[in-house]
């Protein structure tokens, strides 16, 4: 939870593709502005999602969940926590 | 910020060999149904996608990465 | 056109330090794996590292891992190679090479740096 | 890691020979080889990738074959500019080695 508030567009985009849902995908690329030929280089992706099934698209997930919770992941996450609150105390 | 470890694992999938990127999913999800997966997935977007296609996914990447939605 | 430059090579002393730099142009340098490959004196083409687009993965031949470290700007359009702690061994021509997206082929090389490790 | 081997080590031809290099490794690469040029003093030169696919601007007369373990780089009538060294190359995993190299010498 913690990697996607990080970085929400990101994760938006990739479980569009990986969902295989074509509309989703579209709108999540709208909020980048990506160009036509962006677009359909990320179509082509997401139909290798979309060949290879349910359990394809639900392996993948759980890869990406791993990593985005993963300790090289977490320790991240936490140090930029701790390098905000120094920044919202010199802040003040 | 993206967590580096994601974005290895997203750019080994677009430009890594398929060894390289199961290589590093292994580092993860050592599971054989796992790995075997990740090859399949990685195979066929490096069939389907040519260098120009490449050019363009990574370019949504930089989108992504350079948001103010990330 | 596409184009990649090395400069920096020369001659040092064993145990010296030299920094190899290789500009790149006529592409979006960003998007590209670079190598480094060397070819010592009248010998075979080895491959030294590989440096991904946005330097998330680095890989290096046994031979220099530990005393190379290869690193990239890419505002700059430039590649570079620190070699620490040289031995006799690693005197050679050294090319910086790009790694195509779709078929992992060095297609583009520099015209290549040499480097002479000598007391 | 995956050796290379390549053979003939040196080759002695004629303009117009048919000229075949083969090249051998230690585990299966798929199609994740290429095939690379070399004149004295100058950087390699990417002839053929993906095992079989000629590189643009490369002549039709060399051609490449095999996947796995064995493949093959040929010459189909040498030219005098094809006198160089042939170098084969793995691109299935890192470290991403080469073969020795194959001298193309005039007869």
């Known amino acids: 939870v913690k990697m996607a508030e990080t970085c929400p567009i990101f994760y938006d985009v990739f479980f569009a593709v990986a969902n295989g849902n074509e509309l989703l995908l579209d709108l999540s690329l709208t909020k980048v502005n990506a160009t036509e030929p962006e677009r359909t280089a990320m179509k082509k992706i997401q139909d290798c999602y979309v060949e290879n099934g349910l359990i394809s698209r639900v392996l993948d997930g759980l890869v990406m969940t791993t990593i985005s919770s993963s300790k090289d992941c977490m320790g991240e996450a936490v140090q930029n926590t701790v390098e905000d609150l120094k920044l919202n105390t010199l802040g003040r | 910020e993206i967590c580096p470890a994601v974005k290895r694992d997203v750019d080994l999938f677009l430009t890594g060999t398929p060894d390289e990127y199961v290589e590093q999913v292994a580092q993860y999800k050592a599971l054989p149904v796992v790995l075997e997966n990740a090859r399949i997935l990685k195979n066929c977007v490096d069939a389907k996608m040519t260098e120009e296609d490449k050019e363009n996914a990574l370019s949504v990447l930089d989108k992504i990465y350079t948001s103010p939605l990330c | 056109e596409v184009q990649l430059v090395e400069s920096g090579g020369g001659l040092v002393k064993p145990g010296g330090s030299l920094r190899l730099s290789c500009a790149a142009s006529?592409?979006?340098?960003?998007?590209?794996?670079i190598n480094w490959v060397r070819q010592a004196p009248g010998k075979g083409l080895e491959w030294v590292s590989l440096?991904?687009?946005?330097?998330?993965?680095?890989y290096y031949a046994d031979s220099v891992k530990g005393r190379f470290t290869v690193s990239r700007d890419n505002a700059k359009n430039s590649l570079y190679l620190q070699m620490n702690s040289l031995r006799a061994e690693d005197t050679a021509v050294y090319y910086c090479?790009?790694?195509?997206?779709?078929?992992?082929?060095?297609?583009?090389w520099g015209q290549g740096t040499t480097v002479t490790v000598s007391s | 890691d995956i050796q290379l081997t390549q053979s003939p080590s040196f080759l002695s031809a004629s303009v117009g020979d048919r000229v075949t290099i083969t090249c051998w490794a230690s585990?299966?690469?798929?199609?994740?080889l290429a095939w690379y040029q070399q004149k004295p003093g100058k950087a390699p030169k990417l002839l053929i990738y993906?095992?079989?696919t000629l590189q643009s601007g490369v002549p039709s007369r060399f051609s490449g074959s095999g996947s796995g373990t064995e493949f093959t780089l040929t010459i189909s009538s040498l030219q005098p500019e094809d006198f160089a060294t042939y170098y084969c190359?793995?691109?299935?995993?890192?470290?991403?080695?080469f073969g020795p190299g194959t001298k193309v010498d005039i007869k």
């Open positions: 190359q793995q691109l299935n995993s890192y470290p991403f080695t």
């Open positions: 440096i991904s687009g946005s330097s998330s993965y680095i």
């Open positions: 006529g592409f979006t340098f960003r998007n590209y794996n």
């Open positions: 585990q299966g690469i798929s199609s994740y």
């Open positions: 993906s095992a079989s």
């Open positions: 090479a790009r790694r195509t997206l779709s078929y992992y082929v060095m297609d583009v």
